[in-house]
């Protein structure tokens, strides 16, 4: 789980070691702060749990792509 060391900076110290179905993911945010030990992605699930994931993993990239497509507004 993400840790807020000094709000508002949230850092991840461990990553999930399992894929999470993309259908369970609601949104994500990237963690790039120099105050954090590693770059990370924090996914928020449909039941509002927050999960730290490794942005280098393919499933994480696929999930972010999927969520990006989902949130794009349709062109008229």
């Amino acid at each position: 789980q993400p840790d807020a060391i000094n709000a508002p900076v949230t850092c991840c110290y461990n990553f999930t070691n399992r894929k999470i179905s993309v259908q369970r993911l609601a949104s994500y945010r990237r963690i790039t702060s120099s105050k954090c030990p590693k770059e990370a992605v924090i996914f928020k699930t449909i039941v509002a749990k927050e999960i730290c994931a490794d942005p280098k993993q393919k499933w994480v990239q696929d999930s972010m792509d999927h969520l990006d497509k989902q949130t794009q507004t349709p062109k008229t």
Epitope: K19, I20, V22, I46, V47, K49, D62
Partner: antibody
Framework: QVQLVQSGAEVKKPGASVKVSCKVS????????MHWVRQAPGKGLEWMGG????????IYAQKFQGRVTMTEDTSTDTAYMELSSLRTEDTAVYYC????????????WGQGTLVTVSS | DIVMTQSPDSLAVSLGERATINCKSS????????????LVWYQQKPGQPPKLLIN???TRESGVPDRFSGSGSGTDFTLTISSLQAEDVAVYYC?????????FGQGTKVEIK
């Protein structure tokens, strides 16, 4: 395509334990979240527990807590379900089942393992 | 925990007639941002594992005949077999996958009248 192959039927005495295996092929076990569902004769489907990646741990149905242990051997891509202190009402077919990254629901099932508990 | 309640427990329908099974959840299975209901329907025949028929409450799995349809949203769902065939005799289950623990309905047995 995921394939799940379970161990064979077992006959156990009340009070004993049983360990059912589920061998994964087509994917590695660490890419999946394995769950176990049982079905007593003439009864419905009952979720027993499984790996919840949102919590990062295996979770169990309250009914089975303390009696069931679900483990994995990632070197052989095999999942195990051990049920202890068996009673006659544990006689059932036990299924392993898993979801797919793109689906989120149980779309792959093992063939089932019949466990008979009888004195 | 989310409780899933199916009705009826069993029904007998003539060949070629419509069969309707209802499933009610104790809380909403709709995630509105995705506009998806986290509910599936399974068919189970004796000695076989459950077979997935419908996902997302209304999407037929590949290879499932179009006489099977799913509808509903939120807490109330329906599986309809528009024209019952002999091979449809089975037990049907709904299951939610919105939040753990995953829960099933008690099942509905469909027979031929």
């Amino acid at each position: 395509q995921v394939q799940l192959v379970q161990s064979g039927a077992e006959v156990k005495k009340p009070g004993a334990s049983v360990k059912v295996s589920c061998k994964v092929s087509g994917y590695t076990l660490t890419e999946l979240s394995m769950h176990w569902v049982r079905q007593a004769p003439g009864k419905g489907l009952e979720w027993m527990g499984g790996f919840d990646p949102e919590d990062g741990e295996t979770i169990y149905a309250q009914k089975f807590q303390g009696r069931v242990t679900m483990t994995e051997d990632t070197s052989t891509d095999t999942a195990y379900m051990e049920l202890s202190s068996l009673r006659t009402e544990d006689t059932a077919v036990y299924y392993c089942t898993t979801d797919d990254f793109w689906s989120g629901y149980f779309d792959y099932w093992g063939q089932g393992t019949l466990v008979t508990v009888s004195s | 925990d989310i409780v899933m309640t199916q009705s009826p427990d069993s029904l007998a329908v003539s060949l070629g007639e419509r069969a309707t099974i209802n499933c009610k959840s104790s809380q909403s299975l709709l995630y509105s941002s995705k506009n998806k209901n986290y509910l599936v329907w399974y068919q189970q025949k004796p000695g076989q594992p459950p077979k997935l028929l419908i996902n997302w409450a209304s999407t037929r799995e590949s290879g499932v005949p179009d006489r099977f349809s799913g509808s509903g949203s939120g807490t109330d769902f329906t599986l309809t077999i528009s024209s019952l065939q002999a091979e449809d005799v089975a037990v049907y289950y709904c299951q939610q996958y919105y939040s753990s623990p995953w829960t099933f309905g008690q099942g509905t047995k469909v027979e031929i009248k």
